[in-house]
């Protein structure tokens, strides 16, 4: 399956955060909300598929609670009245830990993937096509909320890149009721005229190989890896790049390359036998200086969950972990457009690219 | 025939400035990685800087950052070594070259270099 | 910065004689190491690439091999006109450095 035609990501919204479903849930719908559980305040987030903003409708709530061990409540609320609690006494989260959270719409449910494994299936008690709405309260930061719309397209193996048929441009500022914490950037740095989400499948209309598993039950089935993809029209400032995974738990590296022809723009390097993310770039077989620095402790952690937003400027690229700014890296190759090919290798296993 | 020619050395007083060109016949200086490597008299050789102009690079020495600035003509097919405040150290023997490249390799080996011209810095 | 120490600085040789030029990297270069020859008041000339690749017009009798951080540049049989400076330059690592250079001489 191959998607195209997809709503542009919320980039680090604010939380509380209401945000506009452009053409509301369809069947083959992904959404997925990445971020971190905050550590300090709260026992509880949400995530809500509603019809409008008011919170009376929601055809979907899915409710973490780290309360009497951890559980996970799913309802529904229609005209303002909760329905029977579906209750999974599993807790996938972990508190101060980031995650990446998927929801596929289906004819008869929701499926809840939480970082690239099957969590829950919630049946629908109210028609999805109401929804147009997507909210997220309690103690969570977000890095991104996405969408994928399904088309079906003749898919090359391994993934698949469609480009839009129509630019497509971010959506008002949500409706965030605080500030985004220090350190994030502004969620809509300018329009975005392409987005490409990277699936991938291992035969014509299976999405993996697992011959067991029904196609399009995991929407993040495992990257290929390396993975290699193309960035179509090569950066550009305001260009976005959204990559989420989970770190081995024996991981020692791994790298996201950005790359011009025989050269690499950019190499991002988590190194955990150095406990250092390093930056550099490579011409002609030739490496630069590295750039090591960083404000905080290394944010890849082995067997942890991760996301990576690279955002390139006029000047540079800025790179955020988890929602959180951690560098910037000034452009050694400045003609951006001719930097147009993404490599990702090395000890993690993809589970979201969007380029 | 590839060639190389460079020119503009000469005799200057410290912190005075110079402009070095490297005229390219032969290939196209836009695609290629032009390098400026200096040998001071009686010494060995040491890079300078580099230039990739499609792919909009450059890259300079440690000891010329911030003094010398590399670039391309490509509708002139040269490129330029501007140095600014120019020291005694800097006297030297100034060659430009092309990296060698092919289909099996790429790197920063210079298989073509200039005849070389002589810049002395002093007083 | 990655250091090139390149040995022996100076040596004679007869015509004739096989001739080893060592170079050690200070850290691991890959294979990315050139050897050039340089004649006084010419400017240098491509002999090796890619530590062993020979380049195109260049004699047999020259030679490049690596093993780990040391890089070797071997004339099978000195000839007249190879009496020259030798250096070796690694790309691995920005800055590109060279070799402080040997000269063969003759005995």
């Known amino acids: 399956m191959a998607f195209s035609g997809s709503q542009a990501p919320y980039l680090s919204p604010a939380v509380p955060f209401s945000g506009t479903i452009q053409g509301g849930l369809q069947d083959g719908l992904q959404i997925t909300v990445n971020g971190t559980v905050l550590s300090s305040s709260g026992t509880r987030f949400a995530v809500n598929f509603q019809t409008g903003f008011s919170g009376n409708d929601i055809a979907f709530h899915f409710n973490p609670r780290f309360e009497d061990g951890g559980y996970v409540v799913c309802n529904t609320r229609q005209n303002g009245s909760w329905g029977p609690e579906e209750r999974k006494t599993h807790m996938p989260f972990q508190k101060g830990m980031p995650f990446d959270l998927c929801f596929l719409v289906q004819s008869s449910d929701f499926k809840v993937m939480v970082n690239g494994i099957l969590f829950v299936q919630y049946f629908h008690r109210v028609p999805f096509h109401r929804v147009d709405t997507i909210s997220v309260n309690g103690s969570v930061q977000l890095s991104y909320i996405s969408f994928q719309n399904p088309r079906t397209v003749p898919v090359q193996p391994a993934f698949s890149t469609v480009p839009f048929s129509q630019p497509v441009c971010f959506p008002p500022r949500p409706r965030g009721r605080r500030q985004k914490p220090p350190g994030v950037w502004p969620a809509n740095p300018a329009p975005i005229t392409q987005t490409v989400i990277h699936t991938v499948q291992s035969a014509p209309g299976q999405m993996f190989s697992t011959p067991a598993i029904p196609p399009m039950m995991y929407p993040h089935p495992a990257y290929p890896m390396p993975f290699i993809t193309t960035i179509l029209g090569g950066l550009y400032p305001s260009k976005s790049i959204l990559l989420s995974g989970t770190v081995l738990p024996s991981a020692q590296r791994f790298h996201i390359n950005l790359c011009s022809g025989n050269h690499i723009a950019f190499h991002l390097n988590p190194r955990f036998d150095e406990n250092a993310v390093v930056r550099n770039t490579q011409i002609d077989n030739s490496w630069g200086s590295e750039e090591r620095s960083l404000p905080r402790k290394m944010p890849f952690v082995r067997g942890q969950s991760f996301s990576v937003w690279i955002l390139c400027e006029a000047h540079c690229l800025k790179v955020a972990v988890d929602g959180q700014h951690l560098f910037e890296y000034y452009h050694r190759l400045r003609n951006l457009p001719t930097i147009n090919r993404l490599e990702v290798g090395g000890d993690i296993q993809l589970t979201h690219v969007q380029t | 025939e590839v060639q190389l020619v460079e020119s503009g050395g000469g005799l200057v007083q410290p912190g005075g400035s110079l402009r070095l060109s490297c005229a390219a016949s032969?290939?196209?200086?836009?695609?290629?990685?032009i390098h400026w490597v200096r040998q001071a008299p009686g010494k060995g050789l040491e890079w300078v800087a580099s230039?990739?102009?499609?792919?909009?690079?450059?890259s300079y020495a440690d000891s010329v950052k911030g003094r010398f600035t590399i670039s391309a003509d490509t509708s002139k097919n040269t490129a330029y070594l501007q140095m600014n405040s120019l020291r005694a150290e800097d006297t030297a023997v100034y060659y430009c070259a092309r990296s060698y490249s092919s289909e099996t390799h790429y790197g920063w080996a210079m298989d073509y270099w200039g005849q070389g011209t002589l810049v002395t810095v002093s007083s | 910065d990655i250091q090139m120490t390149q040995s022996p600085s100076s040596l004679s040789a007869s015509v004739g004689d096989r001739v080893t030029i060592t170079c050690r990297a200070s850290q691991s270069v890959s294979s990315a190491v050139a050897w050039y020859q340089q004649k006084p008041g010419k400017a240098p000339k491509l002999l090796i690439y890619s530590a062993s690749s020979l380049y195109s017009g260049v004699p047999s009798r020259f030679s490049g091999s690596r093993s780990g951080t040391d890089f070797t540049l071997t004339i099978s049989s000195l000839q007249p006109e190879d009496f020259a400076t030798y250096y070796c330059q690694q790309w691995s690592q920005s800055p590109v450095t060279f070799g402080q250079g040997t000269k063969v001489e003759i005995k």
């Open positions: 230039i990739y102009s499609s792919y909009g690079y450059t």
């Open positions: 032969g290939f196209t200086v836009y695609s290629s990685s």
